[in-house]
Structures are given as structure tokens and as C-alpha cells.
């Protein structure tokens, strides 16, 4: 190798200056005794190199690029060799930003996968390889004192979420959780969450069903629907409140919300609806009165209200 480039820093803040030096060894005898060293950033020749001969006979050229405005570029030093440019050495330059503080960190406990899933927003593009690590520890109190550290959770490339498996969790005990972002220009940390995994539990919704008509029960009145639901068994012992939503299948009507309903109701008569109309219904539940996340809405149930009221009357709810 005849030439060697060294740079003040291969990775800088976007727009910052960068200084580079290219040294050509004396024993490259096939070169001119006084070769002119040229600089190129990407495909563009860069003026402003200051060249000098050092005491040991080597040639050095120093260039300062006042603003590196490319997020990635190759800087090369070269010599004119006949009619072509002979590249002696090149380095990759990167420019970008230190990571912003990750924000909107939130977690939910999935009882099906037995894991705590946390997600965050990484902030603006840094233009540099940036790693995110979900860090956590167990705490007996309100996370002021740190207990056992939990193995770092590293998301797959490009993902802004990570799952902490059950073996690293302790339910009904607080955990300190935060995200650390790191790249060549710096490190940042999100504000710390302090939570008990059970307080962010997200349940599966019940399954809506049509109520089987029983011989002794009166049929639904006009504009009423009888429905029941099957709770999600693994969450059965968790106190919950639920809500229904419904809308006519035809037309542009928005969802109407009914609730809160106790999970234990298990069946319900919904009235005040249009007669002889097909409705779409869904249900969702949340741990309550203790904290939790709403479940997703259940798969839809489609039911049709009756055309006219039966002659006899029975107790029903109005909505």
C-alpha cells in the first residue's frame, strides 16, 4: 500500500467538519518525486488539500471538509496516473445524529404467551446504526431501589418492541423498565417505567354467542336481542368489566357502546334497537377494579332483531 488515510473521526454529527490526512510512503519509487495528492468525496473532487513533504521523505496532504452533509460517503486520496486517477486509499465516512430519547414506552402482559411485551417510539432517524435495548430490574418497592437485574431484551433489527419472557418476570412485584438507545455518537435512555406486570395485563375477549332459546323463556321483544358470552377461561378468575358495541350491518351508522357490563353477567338482553334489522355486535373486557389494558374487540356476532313484539311482556334492559 502506497497511501494511507487517517481521519479525525470516521463518524460525525451531520454537518460537522471532518479533517483527513493522506500519507504517501517514500519507497513508492514508481511515483513522481513530488506527486500531487488529490482528494475525492464520493465522485466529487475536493479542493483545499494542503500538501507537504515530511522529514522522513513521505508526502502528506491534509484536508478539512467544513460540513459533512452526506450521511454516508467514501473519502479517497488519489494520484494522477497517466490519464486516470489512481486511488491510494479510501475510508468510509458516516454522519448522523446521536439517538433521541426513546419515548412513549408502554408494556402489556400477555397471559397466553406468558410474556411482557414492551414497545416504544425510537424518535427521529439517526442515519447511523443504532441499537435499542430494553433494560429492566426487579424491585420490592416503587423502583427507587434496584433488585435483581433482568437479562437485557434486544429487539430484532428495525423493531421497536421486545418481549420479556415469563422466567424473567415476577408477577405482583414492581419492575423498573426503560429503553437504552446507543450509536457511535452517543447514548440516550427513556424515562423509566415502574410497573407490576399484572397491572398491564391484556386479556383475551369473551366469545359472543346467541342465547339458546329455552322453552320457558319468552322470545325477545321487537327491537331486542338476546346474547350471551363465553369468558376466556384462563382469565376467568380476574375481576373484569366488559362493554358491548353494536351497529346495524347496513348503512353508515357508527358503533354504539353499551356498558359497563360485569363479566359475570354472561348473558344480556339488548333493547332499543331497530326491529327486523341485522346487527353486528362485539364485546371487550378489562381487568377491573385493578389496573389493566382493554382486550381487543371480540370476533363479531351477527344477529337480527325480531319483526314484532310478542303479546306477553317480560323484564328487559333499556339502552
Amino acid at each position: 500500500e502506497c497511501g494511507h488515510i487517517s481521519v479525525s473521526a470516521p463518524i460525525v454529527h451531520l454537518g460537522d467538519p471532518i479533517t483527513a490526512s493522506c500519507i504517501i510512503k517514500q519507497n513508492c519509487s514508481h511515483l513522481d518525486p513530488e506527486p500531487q495528492i488529490l482528494w475525492r468525496l464520493g465522485a466529487e473532487l475536493q479542493p483545499g488539500g494542503r500538501q507537504q513533504r515530511l522529514s522522513d521523505g513521505t508526502q502528506e496532504s491534509i484536508i478539512t471538509l467544513p460540513h459533512l452533509n452526506h450521511t454516508q460517503a467514501f473519502l479517497s486520496c488519489a494520484l494522477n496516473w497517466g490519464n486516470s486517477l489512481q486511488i491510494l486509499d479510501q475510508v468510509e465516512l458516516r454522519a448522523g445524529y446521536p439517538p433521541a430519547i426513546p419515548h412513549n414506552l408502554s408494556c402489556l402482559m400477555n397471559l397466553t404467551t406468558s410474556s411482557l411485551i414492551c414497545q416504544w417510539e425510537p424518535g427521529p432517524e439517526t442515519h447511523l446504526p443504532t441499537s435499542f435495548t430494553l433494560k429492566s430490574f426487579k424491585s420490592r418497592g416503587n423502583c427507587q431501589t434496584q433488585g435483581d437485574s433482568i437479562l437485557d431484551c434486544v429487539p430484532k433489527d428495525g423493531q421497536s418492541h421486545c418481549s420479556i419472557p415469563r422466567k424473567h418476570l415476577l408477577l405482583y412485584q414492581n419492575m423498573g423498565i426503560w429503553v437504552q438507545a446507543e450509536n457511535a455518537l452517543g447514548t440516550s435512555m427513556s424515562p423509566q417505567l415502574c410497573l407490576d406486570p399484572m397491572d398491564v395485563v391484556k386479556l383475551e375477549p369473551p366469545m359472543l354467542r346467541t342465547m339458546d332459546p329455552s322453552p320457558e323463556a319468552a322470545p325477545p321483544q321487537a327491537g331486542c336481542l338476546q346474547l350471551s358470552w363465553e369468558p376466556w377461561q384462563p382469565g376467568l378468575h380476574i375481576n373484569q368489566k366488559c362493554e358491548l358495541r353494536h351497529k346495524p350491518q347496513r348503512g353508515e351508522a357508527s358503533w354504539a357502546l353499551v356498558g359497563p357490563l360485569p363479566l359475570e353477567a354472561l348473558q344480556y338482553e339488548l333493547c332499543g334497537l331497530l326491529p327486523a334489522t341485522a346487527y353486528t355486535l362485539q364485546i371487550r373486557c378489562i381487568r377491573w377494579p385493578l389496573p389493566g389494558h382493554w382486550s381487543d374487540w371480540s370476533p363479531s356476532l351477527e344477529l337480527r332483531t325480531t319483526e314484532r313484539a310478542p303479546t306477553h311482556h317480560h323484564h328487559h334492559h333499556h339502552h
Epitope: 415469563r166 384462563p234 376467568l236 380476574i238 359475570e264 377494579p289
Partner: antibody
Framework: EVQLLESGGGLVQPGGSLRLSCAAS????????MGWVRQAPGKGLEWVSS????????PYADSVKGRFTISRDNSKNTLYLQMNSLRAEDTAVYYC???????????WGQGTLVTVSS | DIQMTQSPSSLSASVGDRVTITCRAS??????LNWYQQKPGKAPKLLIY???NLQNGVPSRFSGSGSGTDFTLTISSLQPEDFATYYC?????????FGGGTKVEIK
């Protein structure tokens, strides 16, 4: 401190009835599922029945379905097990227990012995 | 119904031994597996809930692992007070079932 105290056990003839009670203290009784578990002499544990916090859901083991009824009185912090048509195989120590949110039993009462014999 | 099979039904061990008890569910139960200890003439006591969570006040020599269908209770160094019968229980769905029990005896 959470405490559960069963009562009502004793000797009863086959076909007879008995009502077990479990008095709870030290926690908000109305917020928790409760359950009964029994243990025949020298045998393992057998779940009998559970009841939801407000009493609306009451699953039973097949072996007692139609004969036993679980109930609760949240105003008295008391759990009950009404046992009818008793059989010799119902002879056991009956424990009442508080259920955790993910279905575990903790704590347990000290147990009450039910003996069905002629 | 989900059946719970516990093994071994009994074992002999010495103080200081590492003891492992297994529990197998007839179908997947996620992490809904609890472990209890019972001493003669006493009510059962909860050791581990949700497969691996140590109940408050239970010594750290007890640990639980597994998910799906296969679960393990481990006592890392058996102490004199640990000689008892151990039961697993599934709480994934009704009817809730207990394993047949494992009696840990002094060798």
C-alpha cells in the same frame, strides 16, 4: 392476615345432607373467587367447586355436579357448600381456599372432616 | 378435561440433595401451573404460581419451570422441613385438576 375457618363437618348417613361454612377475614372477600377442595383419607387433592366474586359463575367437578351447591354471602364474608345425597366416597377433609387471579389456591383453611357412613 | 400426571409418585432423598418433580398436562396450559406442599395433618401451602413465580415467604431453594405441557418443581438443596407431599394443579380451565402427588421421604 388472611384467615379462612371452615365449620359444619361431621358424621352423616349416606343420602343425607350437610352444609359447610367458611368464614373469611383479613381481605376484601367480595373481590375474590373462592373454592372448595377435598382430600379423602390417604388420597390426593380433588377440586370440588369454585365461585366467582359476586356468585354468578359456579363450576363443579363432575363427581359432585347436581348434588352440591356452592354459594357465598359477601355481606357476611362467608362461603358455603351445601352437600346433598351424600355418598361414602364423599368422605374427606374439605378445605376452603381463596383463589388468586390466575387460579391458584392461597391461602387454605384448616379443613373440616366430613364422614359419610351408616 | 385436562389431566395432570405427576412423577415420581414418591422419592427418597437426603438433606442437601437436589430434587426434581415433574408434572405433565394432557394438553397445553400455557403457564397456568401451580405447586403446593402438604405436610401430614396440615392444609396444603402454595409454593409456586403461574409456573415459576415464588409465593411470598417461600424459600428460594424452591423453583418452578416449564410451559405448555411439561413442568418441573426443583428443590435445589433439600432441607429437613421439605419432607412432605407435593402437588401440581392446572388453573387454565375448568375442571381444575391436581396431579396425583409426589411424596418426598427421608432416605
Amino acid at each position: 392476615e388472611v384467615q379462612l375457618l371452615e365449620s359444619g363437618g361431621g358424621l352423616v348417613q349416606p343420602g343425607g345432607s350437610l352444609r359447610l361454612s367458611c368464614a373469611a377475614s383479613g381481605f376484601t372477600f367480595s373481590l375474590y373467587w373462592m373454592g372448595w377442595v377435598r382430600q379423602a383419607p390417604g388420597k390426593g387433592l380433588e377440586w370440588v367447586s369454585s365461585i366467582s366474586s359476586s356468585g354468578g359463575v359456579t363450576p363443579y367437578a363432575d363427581s359432585v355436579k347436581g348434588r352440591f351447591t356452592i354459594s357465598r354471602d359477601n355481606s357476611k364474608n362467608t362461603l358455603y357448600l351445601q352437600m346433598n345425597s351424600l355418598r361414602a366416597e364423599d368422605t374427606a377433609v374439605y378445605y376452603c381456599a381463596k383463589l388468586g387471579e390466575l387460579g391458584w389456591f392461597d391461602p387454605w383453611g384448616q379443613g373440616t372432616l366430613v364422614t359419610v357412613s351408616s | 378435561d385436562i389431566q395432570m400426571t405427576q412423577s415420581p409418585s414418591s422419592l427418597s432423598a437426603s438433606v442437601g440433595d437436589r430434587v426434581t418433580i415433574t408434572c405433565r398436562a394432557s394438553q397445553g396450559i400455557s403457564s397456568y401451573l401451580n405447586w403446593y406442599q402438604q405436610k401430614p395433618g396440615k392444609a396444603p401451602k402454595l409454593l409456586i404460581y403461574y409456573a415459576s413465580n415464588l409465593q411470598n415467604g417461600v424459600p428460594s431453594r424452591f423453583s418452578g419451570s416449564g410451559s405448555g405441557t411439561d413442568f418441573t418443581l426443583t428443590i435445589s438443596s433439600l432441607q429437613p422441613e421439605d419432607f412432605a407431599t407435593y402437588y401440581c394443579q392446572q388453573s387454565y380451565s375448568y375442571p381444575q385438576k391436581f396431579g396425583g402427588g409426589t411424596k418426598v421421604e427421608i432416605k
